[in-house]
Interface confidence: low
């Protein structure tokens, strides 16, 4: 967990003396953009608990890792939620403090409640100033539950939350109806993401067994230790008045940590410092109790005495939480005889030891070949052993040789030697070799001679367009295989470099020299052919085409359709940018025009062979629609259509075309010609009995005109299935005019 503590000074007689301090023990914390991480942020969070506006609070930075908030003018300024944010990147963490007004109607028996997933949480609001009205419970500012004022038990209103889940976490409040929100009891509920004693994705991992009231973090399994305790399992007490993950911080003032509330990263929450309790953390622990909020009992054995800050102080020859364990000589366990690391890495080396007294972090050390002694940065304490973890400074070749792990306790000492081999990551001496190239891919042989140590575990190929500032694309390949760089741009130069890796952390070597490889752009050789075309209107033409079926990927980026109007000497070009397309609708053409049409495949800027041309005559603009079309059933197989001629005709009508379709049918409509243009009625025969039909019609002069309105009519019943609709004249052949 991030080493971040939010301290609240609870000497509340004068709000102007109240302050909040956020302290980070992280390296480089709070220095902002000129150092490693973003600055510490300390602010009041008004999203849930809003207070009347007052003068702005003052933020003061004290050194690189501390920030303090002052300038509270009245008690109501203090009420609510404060947060401190620290740590960088994925470790960025928010610590929250909830402040209750000491004069509120309702006060929380306990502000912070940390519970496990699936537990029942009980929030208890104690009546401080009674009102005979209902109590409203809220969760994160939203209404949650109402309790009748008669439901107080023992002067307390209880909210029971069974089977809590992580989304139940947040700020809860209990408020008398129609009372000021500042008189509420505010609580913080923290629900760990796992059941008791478990952590990790799926909660499959077992917590280390945090001591002294430490809480197991559900994401990383580390113990978040109460203020005044340290160690992997919070097994060690700090000296009185100290806090922080390594006991590196000191409480301000002569009375130590009295009157201070400590808030730590979730899932710990807030508590008094070690040795103190009470709503304002001003009461010392009762005899036999110790730790944060005095929650722990000493129960010392074998003559041990209880210290309210650290617990049992054991006489010589005894150790353990209750002085229950006797001492014996320590021993180093299962140390590997040889370890291998890569140059310039900062590995972690573990050394495990057992003994009585139990070896602690400071009692295990690591000695390098040059005599430098390293102290462990972390220790994992288990029932049968302590494992010290050493963060080794950046390795150099001179670090190769024999290292030694040594453990010393009052029970004696032990040591083990082991060999460390420092290996040099491989660096390519030559550029990769181009084997074959296509328009959108390059086949590359990546394995080249190299300096440094093998074996080669992975080969990374980095590539990007020449002279580009964009990020490099990277492909990881098997050392023994050639690499195909795909989805490249045709006719483009690519800078390609190899990076080799050997096994282990930091095994990636420097990038090798670059080489320039250029993709091809072969001429498209496929000749399309025009499958068909049909006129969809006087200025619209639907064209479809095909390509020969050839094996392998299609060499092409799209199609170019060309329309040549010989009369006007004009060429129209239509780009179809998908090589998968096989049809296009050409619009905005000139009615009554003779066009020559062809299609060709293109690739980059190269055009393939054109299709054999087609000759298309667009009809001139057609006449207006016939008027007042009407349908009347005559029998079970005949319907009569009547209409009026179009108005304002540009010339004599050559024929009418009737469209017949079964209502709701999915098939293509049938077109029937009426070859006597002077007629204003026709009978459609051969229809099915008891069937609804749709009809519309248009006139033709040199070209087809606009459609009339659609009319609907049903044939009469009791007829036989007919062959299909006919009219005295022949069926029209309008359609594919190829």
């Amino acid at each position: 967990a991030v080493d971040l503590t939010l301290l609240a000074n609870l000497r509340l007689t004068d709000p102007q003396r109240f302050f909040l301090t956020c302290v980070s023990g992280e390296a480089g914390a709070g220095r902002g953009s000129d150092a490693w991480g973003p600055p510490l942020l300390l602010e009041k969070d008004d999203r849930i608990v809003r207070t009347p506006p007052g003068p702005p609070l003052r933020l003061a930075r004290n050194g690189s890792h501390q920030v303090t908030l002052r300038g509270f003018s009245k008690p109501s300024d203090l009420v609510g939620v404060f947060s401190c944010v620290g740590g960088a990147g994925a470790r960025r963490t928010r610590v929250i403090y909830v402040h209750n007004s000491p004069g509120a109607h309702l006060l929380p028996d306990k502000v912070t409640h940390t519970v496990n997933k699936g537990d029942t949480a009980v929030l208890s609001a104690r009546v401080h100033k009674e009102k005979q009205t209902d109590v409203i419970w809220k969760s994160n500012g939203s209404y949650f539950y109402t309790l009748d004022w008669h439901e107080a038990q023992d002067g307390r209103f209880l909210l029971q939350l069974p089977n809590v889940q992580p989304p139940s976490s947040g700020i809860y409040s209990a408020t008398y109806l129609e009372a000021s929100p500042l008189g509420s009891a505010f609580f913080r509920l923290i629900v760990r993401g796992c059941g008791a004693g478990r952590w990790g994705p799926g909660c499959t991992k077992e917590c280390p067994g945090c001591l002294h009231g430490g809480v197991c973090h559900d994401h990383d399994g580390e113990c978040v230790c109460p203020p005044g305790f340290t160690g992997t399992r919070c097994e060690q007490a700090c000296r009185e008045g100290r806090f922080g993950q390594s006991c590196q911080e000191q409480c301000p003032g002569i009375s130590g940590c009295r009157g201070l509330t400590f808030c730590l990263p979730d899932p710990y929450g807030c508590s008094c410092g070690s040795g103190w309790r009470g709503s304002q953390c001003q009461e010392a622990c009762a005899p036999g109790h110790f730790g944060a909020d005095c929650r722990l009992q000493c129960q010392c054995q074998n003559g041990g005495t209880c210290d309210r800050f650290s617990g049992c102080v054991c006489p010589s020859g005894w150790h353990g939480v209750h002085c229950e364990k006797s001492d014996r000589i320590p021993q180093i366990l299962n140390m590997a005889s040889e370890l291998e690391f890569n140059l310039e890495t900062m590995p972690r080396i573990n050394c495990a030891a057992a003994g009585n007294p139990f070896p602690v972090r400071g009692s295990i050390e690591l000695r390098k070949p040059d005599g430098t002694v390293l102290l462990s940065t972390k220790a994992i304490v288990e029932p049968e052993k302590t494992t010290a973890e050493f963060e080794v400074p950046r390795l150099v070749l001179a670090d190769s040789g024999f290292w030694e792990c040594r453990v010393s306790t009052s029970g004696g000492q032990d040591s083990r030697r082991f060999k460390v081999n420092v290996k040099v990551p491989p660096v390519p001496l030559a550029a990769p070799r181009l084997l074959t190239k296509q328009s959108r891919q390059l086949v590359v042989s990546p394995l080249v001679s190299f300096s440094g140590d093998g074996p080669i575990s992975t080969v990374r190929l980095h590539y990007r367009p020449q002279d580009s500032t964009m990020d490099w694309s990277t492909i990881v390949v098997d050392p023994s295989e050639n690499v195909t760089l795909m989805n490249l741009r045709p006719k483009t130069g690519y800078s390609v470099r190899v990076q080799l890796s050997r096994p282990g952390e930091g095994g990636e070597g420097a990038w090798g020299p670059p080489t320039l490889m250029t993709t091809d752009c072969p001429e498209p050789l496929l000749q399309p052919w025009l499958e068909g075309w049909h006129v969809e209107g006087t200025d619209r033409l639907r064209v479809s085409w095909s390509l020969p079926l050839v094996p392998g990927p299609l060499v092409g980026d799209g199609f170019l359709l060309r329309l040549w109007d010989g009369t006007r000497g004009q060429e129209r070009r239509e780009n179809v940018s998908s090589p998968q397309a096989r049809t296009a609708l050409l619009t905005g053409l000139t009615p009554g025009t003779h066009y020559q049409l062809d299609v060709q495949l293109y690739h980059c800027t190269l055009l393939g062979p054109a299709s054999p041309p087609a000759h298309v005559l667009l009809p001139p603009s057609g006449p207006p629609a016939p008027r007042h079309l009407h349908a009347q059933a005559l029998s079970d197989s005949e319907i009569q259509l009547t209409w009026k001629h179009p108005e304002a005709l540009p010339g004599p009508i050559s024929k009418y075309v009737v469209e017949v379709q079964v209502a709701g049918g999915a098939g293509d409509p049938l077109w029937i010609d009426v070859d006597r243009p002077e007629e204003t009625s026709t009978i459609i025969r051969g229809l099915n009995a008891s069937t609804r039909y749709l009809f519309r019609m248009r006139a033709s002069i040199q070209g087809l005109g606009d459609w009339s309105n659609t009319v609907e009519e049903s044939t009469l019943g009791n007829g036989l299935q007919a062959e299909g609709p006919v009219q005295e004249s022949r069926a029209a052949e309008e359609g594919l005019d190829q």
């Epitope: 050789l525 496929l526 000749q527 095909s546 020969p548 079926l549 050839v550 094996p551 392998g552 062979p609």
Partner: antibody, heavy 119, light 107 residues
Amino acid sequence: EVQLLESGGGLVQPGGSLRLSCAASGFTFSQYVMRWVRQAPGKGLEWVSGIYPSGGWTTYADSVKGRFTISRDNSKNTLYLQMNSLRAEDTAVYYCATVAAAAGAFDIWGQGTMVTVSS
Amino acid sequence: DIQMTQSPATLSLSPGARATLSCRASQSVSSYLAWYQQRPGQTPRLLIYGASSRATGIPDRFSGSGSGTDFTLTISRLEPEDFAVYYCQQYGSSRHTFGQGTKLEIK
């Protein structure tokens, strides 16, 4: 019905020439890629040559390159294979084949014509 | 050119049995692979194209699988008319090549 019908096979001496024809019917010949495939007696199939619809692009197996020429006459719906410098190992049944609907594989075959190269 | 290798050369099975024929390409042909059946005295007949698509009219006891370099033709229950020679063919390059064939005979 889609049909391919080969002709022009026969007996020829080593070093001689022969021209095979394949008449297509039942489909739009000019839109399809055409191939020749052969099968020596008791042996497996061997792809020989291919030609694309316009006739502008041809491919050959290494074993016949420089000796055989594939061509087509789209107006006559006919595919040809001109075989020069014939060798004994060219003895085989020669099939013409094309792709109608199988996205690249040969789903239409002729019945084959026998070519025997022997002295 | 891409070489195609079929195995086994001969496969002896009884009617009703399951047949598995293999074909390996010397380099990747993606899924551009076809299987043909040739009965004695007859022209080849397309069974499978695109490695796994059945050609028109082919019974569903024939199935193909694989991509890249390794392919399989499976006949789930052999019928008497299935005993023939089977060829694989790649068309992933413009120079097509066939395998040497697998003869499926009655045991």
